[in-house]
Each structure stands twice: as structure tokens, then as C-alpha cells.
């Protein structure tokens, strides 16, 4: 007997969609080879209609595609714009068409029921709003208009032009009769429930000469759309529930065992702890259209999702939703990488952001994920260079390693720098990630004077002192811009006083400035790599001012001032908006930090070609 | 909470009919599927056919043991299923539990697995004399 396992009886009406589930054991040999569907001929031949290799015969052409699902052992066959010529016995199948790994089925296209003649039929969401229209002649313009609901041979009054509702429809139904002229009256009925299914009748007057006109109502469920994303990455639900909920409260949930659904996050200020620093709510259109971003995605966020509207931010019976089934890839093409880095206070982190590698010259991105409201993110900097005021001198965004990878450090850490950052680009949005970064007790491995002030037209020597542990690691100065810190010549001095547990392997890089100039003023940044990997960095400020005293200057941490202090972000941060979806720059207005100077001027300074290390970066 | 509700076991000659029910309650809509399973002294429960609607589509999987033999319906509004046994053989003895789902679940739910359904009825108890 088959292992592969379907439904026996699939049955239908013309123009509908059937989505038909086969089933298999999900050995290695059955998810990798070929899945197919066939239709069975008079001579028992099976003559393939659509294959899991890309092949869809002439008559399935833009109507019927085949989704394989290798780690469910599943495989599934969409048929659109159905017609009784697609009665008949099919098979769904492994492998080939002839051999037994197969699954009849009997599909079944009716022509759909009866109707009265000049039915007008009407076909609505469950939630969603139907205006009726019933027309009338000149002689039943004054007398009462009614609209009745058939139920078996009886006909219930829903309502009337004399102020009558049916308590079923109560709060949702209005009946609307035109002025002069217009021979129209329609019904306009709000909220659909699946009970409200079914066959209506329209009356004018009463009588021989009464008007009549059926109206077939039928309300469906919303069909779950299926949303296939890769572990790691990210998912968009776009929700468009109509004009009606646009200024009702907007959710959206999650289909839980018990049937109910728990919210994931609302426009009142809920959401659900398990997607802190991974989920967007973004404003609506004026349409009432919204869209919901998750991030960082888990297997455990697979499921059914429900958007909706309803004042109380929750799914209530009778009002718009639209569905998702999300389900969770393992094969997942977006790389591992750490969800938490770690660094300490003053230290630094270097964070490596995955992107789609097909997409190297896509505008790279880093923002704050911030939890108020409905969640936001600003931009802190991109890979044009823009920085936030407050991020100056410490924060940057670099290309390296490359290949579907780039490196953002951030530096003089503090408690606040704590929380959950976004890495994504202005191309594939499925690959935007999160990452948290914890702030732990400990102190920064590498150590760099916090303040110096350097005269002009002297010498300037600013020591970097780190342990032994990276003694084997590549060690650089750069002088640090909004578009990126450009790297330039240190020399190695030897064993340093600061690190008394290390001996001569406690070493010092120096950076020396001669003659200081104007340019010179700004952030450097002492650091450590290996290849293309960053890892931890120290910034030090550098003021220049007019010479007062000859000679050259050599400064040691114990003359080092404090760092400069921050500067506040001003208000204007945006929150994002649907159109970031595409264009992430609208995550926030950017503040541009002013160029500083020409990286160190002349022949002082050797250009690298950037680099990055492995995640976190902070003393263990 | 949904209720489910059989009806229409007792005892049968082998090669006779029978006619089960299952009526759901309880929740002013539909179910999204019912299916029926059986269980012998002793054994595990075994699917037998499930019947799953969307619109105007109807699905219906019938178990390998008894295919051919039973059938499985519903009525118009979606809140009764029946299983019409035709054929039946000894080993058809069992309880016979109703099952119902509310949600369509992720791709990988197979009806034929007891665990993925979400609502079961107390079932009613099928003898097939030979």
C-alpha cells in the first residue's frame, strides 16, 4: 500500500480555487525528489498536469502551482478558476508518474446551486460591510421596503422601511431609501457573521404588484494566506481591512490551541513579551491600512496569524480580519549569528549584520528598536555615512567582512547603550535581523587616554594599550568620520605598564600626530582585528588649540581628562512608516554629523581597506 | 467551548449499516473540520475518514482500513458530520470518537494524527457480530 496520503473526494463549483494536501514520509530520498499531480486517462496513463520541477501543463497555465514543504513531508497543489472540465481522477505522486509512491484523487467541479433567476449574488469576508441594492417601480416608491432573510420555505423579516430589525442584525443593518427619483433602495449590513450566509429577498409594496429581487449572500471565511519565511529572517504582514475600521484600534494575533487568539501586538499599546525587540507595528495609511514586522524569527513563531479591527484591540466575532499561516524554514538561507552580544561599560561591540549576499551594493542600515507605542525604529547610521548626533565618534558601519555580511562597532558603551538593534538594508527585507546587547560588569581590554588636547604644530603620541590576549590580532589607529574611520600608520612600542599580569606581552600601539594641524581635531579609534573581522576599539578625543608651550607632547592615561560629554538626539525621530518597508531611510530623520576635517591630512595618513571580529568584543 | 455529541452506535451484523453522527455546539460558527476516530480495547486510536470545508470545497480523507466501506458527509450548515459504515466486518468493533477543528492549522497538520485535532467527543460504542 502507498505511504503517500491525500483526500479521497475533493468537490467544488466552478470559478472557485482548490488547495489539495498530500502527504508523505519525509525520508531524505522522498523531500528531494520529484513531486507531482496528474490526471488519469481512459487508457490509465497519468499525463502530468504540474511538477515540483517547474513544469505546468497548457491547460494549468497561470492557474495551478505545486509548493513543495520537504521538512513536513508535504506537498501541496493549488488549482485555480475551476471548471467542470476539471472533473475527474487525478493522482498525486513521488517520483514517477508509472511507479506506485502515489495517492488517488477524485476531483469534483459542480456547477454551484440553484439560484432564481436574476439572483444577484454578493461574496464578503466574514467582518467586512455589503450594501445590497434593490430596485422598485414608480408605484411602490411610497409603500414599505423590506428585506427578508429565506430560510428553508419561510422568510424572516431581517428588517423594513418601518423601523424594524431583526435582533440578529441589531447595531448593523440600516436600510436606506433615496430621494425622489432614484428607484433604488438598498440595505447595507456591517460586520458579517458567517450566520448571515444565505439567501435574501428584497420587497417594495406588497401584493401582485410588490417588486422582488433575490440576493444570494454568501460570507467566507478568510482562507489563511500561506507565508513561507526562512528561520533567522523576517516577515511583513500587510493587513488592508477597508475604509469602515480606519480609525478603529488594529491587532494583531496569534491562534493559540485553545482556539482563541492571543494578541501580538495593537495600536493600544499591547504586546506580547515574546517578540520584545523584534516586532513593528507601523502607522496606517489613511486607508486604515497597516502593516506588522517581525524579526529574528523562531520556529516557535510558526502559526496562524489574524489581523484585525476592534475598540478593544482584540478579536471580536463580526469584525475584519484578514489570516496568515506562518511557517518557520530551518533551511534557512540567512547565516547564524549571535541574537546577543555583550560588551562592558566604556568597552565596545562589534556586531556583524548578515544581508542577502546577492545584494552587495544595497544601502546598509542600523537602528534602535524602541518598545513605546507601537514600537519604532530610528536610523543611527547607515552606510552613506549618516550618523545621529549622539552616536558621534563612536558609532560606525563598515562593508567588511562582505559577501552577505557588514560590521557595525559601537564604543564608550554605557548602561543606556543597552537594548535591541535592527541590521537591515534598502533591498530584501526578509533578511533584516536582530540583535540585543547586553551591558555586563567588567572592564575594557583595550585602554586609551580619554581626552587630549594636542597643539598645534607639534607632536602628538597617544598610547593604546592592550593585553596579551591580542597579541596575535592585527592592531590599528583610524581617525573616525561619519562615512567611516580611516585607517592610519601606528607603531607597535612594546611592552606597557598597564597591563602588570601580562609581562612583555602587554603591549602598547601609538598613534603620533606630527606636526598637528587644524584638520587633525576629532575622534580616534584604537582597535584590533583579524582579516576582515573587528574586534574590540577605544576612542579618544582630540582637541587642537594654539601653541603655548614649545616642545612635543606625549600623553599617558594618567593625564587623560574625561571624554567629551554626549550630545542629545533633538526630538525629531519619525516613527516608521509602511513606505520604510521599501526605503528604511524613513525609519527616522536623520541627523547628519558634519564631516570632520580630511581624515588627517597628506602623507600622514595610509588609507586601509576597512575591515571586522568574532561577536561581542568586551573582557571575559 | 465546543461540544461534540455521537450518535448512532450499538450493534450490527457483520455486512450490515449503521449511521453515526456527530453534533458540534457551543460556538456560533463553524467548525473549519470533524473527522472520526476509532479505538479497540487495546489498541491505539486510528483514524478512520475526515470530512474539511472551505466555501463552497469540500475535502474528505478516508482511512486505508476502510475505504471503499464508509463514507463520511455533513449537513448544510456544517455542525453535524456522519459516518455511513456499510460492509461491516468484526474488526470495525471500537469506540467511535468524533473530532473537530476550528482553525486551519500549519501544512504539516495531517488529519489522520489524533494530537493535531483540537475538540473530541466522549464517542459511542460500535459491536460488529459475526
Known amino acids: 500500500k502507498s505511504p503517500v496520503f491525500g483526500p479521497q473526494e475533493v468537490s467544488s463549483v466552478e470559478g472557485n480555487s482548490v488547495s489539495i494536501k498530500c502527504y508523505y514520509p519525509p525520508t531524505s530520498v522522498n523531500r528531494h525528489t520529484r513531486k507531482y499531480w496528474c490526471r488519469k486517462g481512459a487508457s490509465g496513463r497519468c499525463i502530468t498536469l504540474v511538477s515540483s520541477e517547474g513544469y505546468v501543463s497548457s491547460n494549468y497555465a497561470g492557474r495551478a502551482n505545486l509548493t513543495n514543504f520537504p521538512e513536513n513531508g508535504t506537498f501541496v497543489v493549488n488549482i485555480a478558476q475551476l471548471s467542470r472540465d476539471d472533473s475527474g481522477h487525478y493522482k498525486c505522486g513521488l517520483g514517477i508518474n508509472s511507479r506506485g509512491l502515489s495517492f488517488d484523487v477524485s476531483l469534483e467541479v459542480s456547477q454551484g446551486p440553484e439560484l432564481p433567476n436574476g439572483t444577484e449574488v454578493y461574496t464578503v469576508d466574514v467582518g467586512r460591510t455589503v450594501t445590497i441594492k434593490c430596485p422598485f417601480k414608480t408605484e411602490n416608491a411610497p409603500k414599505t421596503k423590506a428585506l427578508y432573510k429565506k430560510i428553508g420555505q419561510t422568510s424572516v423579516l431581517v428588517i423594513d422601511s418601518r423601523n424594524y430589525v431583526n435582533p440578529n442584525y441589531k447595531d448593523r443593518i440600516r436600510l436606506r431609501i433615496p430621494g425622489t427619483g432614484q428607484l433604488i433602495f438598498t440595505v447595507v449590513i456591517d460586520r458579517l457573521r458567517l450566520s448571515d450566509h444565505g439567501l435574501y429577498l428584497c420587497q417594495a409594496g406588497d401584493g401582485s404588484n410588490r417588486d422582488e429581487k433575490n440576493a444570494d449572500l454568501q460570507v467566507l471565511e478568510p482562507e489563511p494566506e500561506l507565508v513561507y519565511e526562512d528561520l533567522r529572517g523576517s516577515v511583513t504582514f500587510h493587513c488592508a481591512l477597508g475604509l469602515e475600521v480606519a480609525n478603529v484600534a488594529k491587532f494583531l494575533c496569534r491562534v493559540n490551541s485553545r482556539e482563541t487568539c492571543d494578541v501580538v501586538i495593537n495600536t493600544l499599546g499591547k504586546r506580547d513579551s515574546a517578540f520584545e525587540g523584534r516586532i513593528l507595528l507601523n502607522p496606517q495609511d489613511k486607508d486604515g491600512s497597516f502593516s506588522v514586522v517581525i524579526t529574528g524569527l523562531r520556529k516557535e513563531d510558526e502559526g496562524r496569524y489574524l489581523c484585525g479591527a476592534h475598540s478593544d484591540g482584540q478579536l471580536q466575532e463580526g469584525w475584519p480580519i484578514q489570516a496568515w499561516q506562518l511557517f518557520v524554514n530551518e533551511e534557512s538561507t540567512i547565516p547564524r549569528s549571535p541574537t546577543v552580544v555583550k560588551g562592558v561599560a566604556g568597552g565596545s561591540v562589534a556586531v556583524l549584520c548578515p544581508y542577502n549576499p546577492k545584494e552587495s551594493q544595497s544601502l546598509k542600515y542600523w537602528c534602535l528598536w524602541e518598545g513605546a507605542q507601537n514600537g519604532r525604529c530610528p536610523l543611527l547610521v547607515e552606510s552613506q555615512g549618516l550618523v545621529q548626533e549622539q552616536y558621534e565618534g563612536r558609532l560606525s558601519l563598515l562593508q567588511e567582512p562582505g559577501n552577505g555580511t557588514f560590521t557595525v562597532i559601537l564604543n564608550q558603551l554605557t548602561t543606556q547603550d543597552a537594548g535591541f538593534y535592527w541590521c537591515l538594508t534598502n533591498g530584501d527585507t526578509r533578511w533584516r535581523t536582530t540583535v540585543e546587547i547586553k551591558i555586563i560588569e567588567g572592564e575594557p581590554n583595550l585602554k586609551v587616554p580619554g581626552n587630549v588636547t594636542a597643539v598645534l604644530g607639534e607632536t602628538l603620541n597617544i598610547p593604546c594599550h592592550f593585553p596579551c590576549k591580542f597579541s596575535s590580532y592585527e592592531k590599528y589607529w583610524c581617525k573616525w568620520s561619519n562615512t567611516g574611520c580611516q585607517t592610519l600608520p601606528s607603531q607597535d612600542e612594546g611592552p606597557s605598564e598597564a597591563f602588570v599580569n601580562c609581562d612583555e606581552n602587554s603591549r602598547l600601539v601609538s598613534l603620533t600626530l606630527n606636526p598637528v594641524t587644524r584638520a587633525d581635531e576629532g575622534w580616534y579609534w584604537c582597535g584590533v582585528k583579524q582579516g576582515h573581522f573587528y574586534g574590540e576599539t577605544a576612542a579618544v578625543y582630540v582637541a587642537v588649540e594654539e601653541k603655548k608651550v614649545a616642545g612635543s607632547r606625549y600623553v599617558s592615561p594618567a593625564k587623560a581628562d574625561a571624554a567629551p560629554d554626549e550630545k542629545v538626539l533633538d526630538s525629531g525621530v519619525r516613527e516608521i512608516e509602511n513606505k520604510a518597508i521599501q526605503d528604511p531611510r524613513l525609519f527616522a530623520e536623520e541627523k547628519v554629523v558634519a564631516d570632520t576635517g580630511d581624515q588627517a591630512g597628506g602623507s600622514r595618513a595610509s588609507v586601509d581597506s576597512s575591515s571586522s571580529e568574532e561577536q561581542g568584543g568586551s573582557s571575559k | 467551548e465546543v461540544q461534540l455529541v455521537e450518535s448512532g452506535g450499538g450493534l450490527v451484523q457483520t455486512g450490515g449499516s449503521l449511521r453515526l453522527s456527530c453534533a458540534a455546539s457551543?460556538?456560533?460558527?463553524?467548525?473549519?473540520?470533524m473527522g472520526w476516530f476509532r479505538q479497540a480495547p487495546g489498541k491505539e486510536r486510528e483514524f478512520v475518514a475526515a470530512?474539511?470545508?472551505?466555501?463552497?470545497?469540500?475535502?474528505?480523507y478516508v482511512g486505508g482500513s476502510v475505504q471503499g466501506r464508509f463514507t463520511i458527509s455533513r449537513d448544510a450548515a456544517g455542525n453535524t458530520v456522519y459516518l455511513q459504515m456499510n460492509s461491516v466486518k468484526p474488526e470495525d468493533t471500537a469506540v467511535y470518537y468524533c473530532?473537530?477543528?476550528?482553525?486551519?492549522?500549519?501544512?504539516?497538520?495531517?488529519?489522520?494524527?489524533?494530537?493535531?485535532?483540537?475538540?473530541w467527543g466522549k464517542g459511542t460504542q460500535v459491536t460488529v457480530s459475526s
Open positions: 473530532a473537530a477543528d476550528r482553525v486551519p492549522k500549519d501544512i504539516s497538520i495531517d488529519p489522520r494524527n489524533p494530537k493535531d485535532w483540537d475538540y
Open positions: 457551543g460556538r456560533t460558527f463553524s467548525p473549519y473540520a
Open positions: 470530512i474539511r470545508w472551505s466555501g463552497a470545497t469540500t475535502y474528505k
